[in-house]
Amino acid sequence: SPVPFGPEGRLEDKLHKPKATQTEVKPSVRFNLRTSKDPEHEGCYLSVGHSQPLEDCSFNMTAKTFFIIHGWTMSGIFENWLHKLVSALHTREKDANVVVVDWLPLAHQLYTDAVNNTRVVGHSIARMLDWLQEKDDFSLGNVHLIGYSLGAHVAGYAGNFVKGTVGRITGLDPAGPMFEGADIHKRLSPDDADFVDVLHTYTRSFGLSIGIQMPVGHIDIYPNGGDFQPGCGLNDVLGSIAYGTITEVVKCEHERAVHLFVDSLVNQDKPSFAFQCTDSNRFKKGICLSCRKNRCNSIGYNAKKMRNKRNSKMYLKTRAGMPFRVYHYQMKIHVFSYKNMGEIEPTFYVTLYGTNADSQTLPLEIVERIEQNATNTFLVYTEEDLGDLLKIQLTWEGASQSWYNLWKEFRSYLSQPRNPGRELNIRRIRVKSGETQRKLTFCTEDPENTSISPGRELWFRKCRDGWRMKNETSPTVELP
């Protein structure tokens, strides 16, 4: 559904009629080369045509150059995430140039005005890059623009306007309002850099989507489906903030993209992997845990460059905080018969037992319905590395364990009073690890006992054939 307000302003209104803010003595766009991790340290200000600051502040022409571009601001000052990102970049890439693009005067406006200023800011960045390109040893290929929210589209404009092609743009939850469905040159797009990777953390298909829903990069990653982020619920926010509000929830989810990127910089030994999938529902079903043909990738800074003919939408689950990495498992359960199912979908839980650790009791989310004489696929994920899996406990929740199911049981009883005991037959569970790409088959401990009913459990152990690799390639980063 369309956003509540469409792109405003007209082509003839822009650029050739400077706003008052653009004629002030202090420039509206400043380039702050951060020479220290310390946010209190002033750093150096770069300006086109002035080479002295480059020398004074030891700008490294041959190193990577990061431009961090903030978004719309209600406060008019830099937010904490920016300092964390600067620090993480300095930690990870010690020789790199880290430049903060300060466009606060143009961003601290009505949202619609800030949007109409993005083109001007993008143009300023492009002019800076064009000037740097005139210097010996400076290469656009070493430039990585990192834009958050509205800043992602500013990065898009910069990549659009620059003479040549920047190496990489990372869009951290690019802004949605006034950009959803916009022309390819009026928003971040794959044409804006050699590699454009995007993290979407606050997309909504109902109401106002703060982040853009449509894919705008070479790879578009939707952690937790791109909408509800763990640890950002009203309860979580109320627990950690004295006066938690919906605004804090929005900020938590929108800003999560930045923290996922920071996590990828500082916790490179704990990389998070995303998996290509056509949509969030299919991912939730556990269908999309393949690494064949570039179908999986690290997220954030460690993302492997992929320039597919078509955009690649990727999904993953995460923890509620750093390190965000979880371990994904696809579970294939073949139900070969069931009795008296009635209208109620069973509620299953699994517990995974491994050589390193055991999981908590994990719910199996039934996205549609349990099919009989068919293989049902589920996605489960654990926060800890379980090691090699040894056994699985499958539990069918008894009706009394859930008020909702109790009510459904009661309704079902009214319509079918003599409904005999419900029962399902499962012989084996096939498990595939997303992170290692290894597959394993688990068989019931007792081959004679394959039935499970409400309130009961069934135990599965590794079948004799053990681990199978099936020519699958594992993710690109070696896992510890």
Epitope: E12, F161, E180, A182
Partner: antibody, heavy 116, light 107 residues
């Protein structure tokens, strides 16, 4: 107000080349993409490609690569499209259009006729 | 390349009627679709962008809707001056592609 003024009609011989111009006024020429669109009599619209005058970046429809070449002169705010090795298939009206929300504004069109 | 298909080459309507023109994309283009009007002997004009937003100065009888692969352009109360060919175009990715056009004829 935004205006795109295109050069006049051309009658060309097969095998020849033609260069069409599109002069822009009323906006900052260098920072908006100018697209070129072909329309043959009784046919629909066909996107040939586009140019960003300030950086001379170009995008071409695969079908027109080698046939069309875009250039721009920022001092005169004029975009050009050269069509080479003309055949009767190239007989059409060619439009330039400036892109922002979509192809916001169009030139009046330049008719090119290829005939021996 | 993304193929945009306008299933009706011609549509006939009367003044005051409501008419809808459809356009189908061969793959998801989200809401990145524009609609153009080309009157006989004139250049095309942008009417709708981003699937549902009216361009500057476009009368409110013209509306657009749709997302994904199916899009509709509607004229709520057709006027005699609406006699034209209407084109959809996706602006999601390069190469930009147009639909074949729908010629609106007034009875």
């Amino acid at each position: 107000q935004v205006q795109l003024q295109q050069s006049g009609a051309e009658l060309m011989k097969p095998g020849a080349s033609v260069k069409i111009s599109c002069k822009a006024t009323g906006y900052t020429f260098s920072t908006y993409w100018i697209a070129w669109v072909k329309q043959r009599p009784g046919h629909g619209l066909e996107w040939i490609g586009e140019i960003l005058p300030g950086s001379a970046k170009t995008k071409y429809n695969k079908k027109f690569k080698g046939k069309a070449t875009f250039t721009a002169d920022t001092s005169s705010n004029t975009a050009y499209m050269q069509l080479s090795s003309l055949t009767s298939e190239d007989s059409a009206v060619y439009y330039c259009a400036v892109y922002d929300y979509g192809a916001d504004y169009w030139g009046q069109g330049t008719s090119v006729t290829v005939s021996s | 390349d993304i193929v945009m298909t306008q299933s009706h080459k011609f549509m006939s309507t009367s003044v005051g009627d409501r008419v809808s023109i459809t356009c189908k994309a061969s793959q998801d283009v989200y809401t990145a679709v524009a609609w153009y009007q080309q009157k006989p002997g004139q250049s095309p004009k942008l009417l709708i962008y981003s699937a549902s937003y009216r361009f500057t100065g476009v009368p409110d009888r013209f509306t657009g809707s749709g997302a994904g692969t199916e899009f509709t352009f509607t004229i709520n109360s057709v006027q005699a001056e609406d006699l034209a060919v209407y084109y959809c175009q996706q602006h999601y990715s390069i190469p930009r592609t147009f639909g074949g056009g729908t010629k609106l004829e007034i009875k």
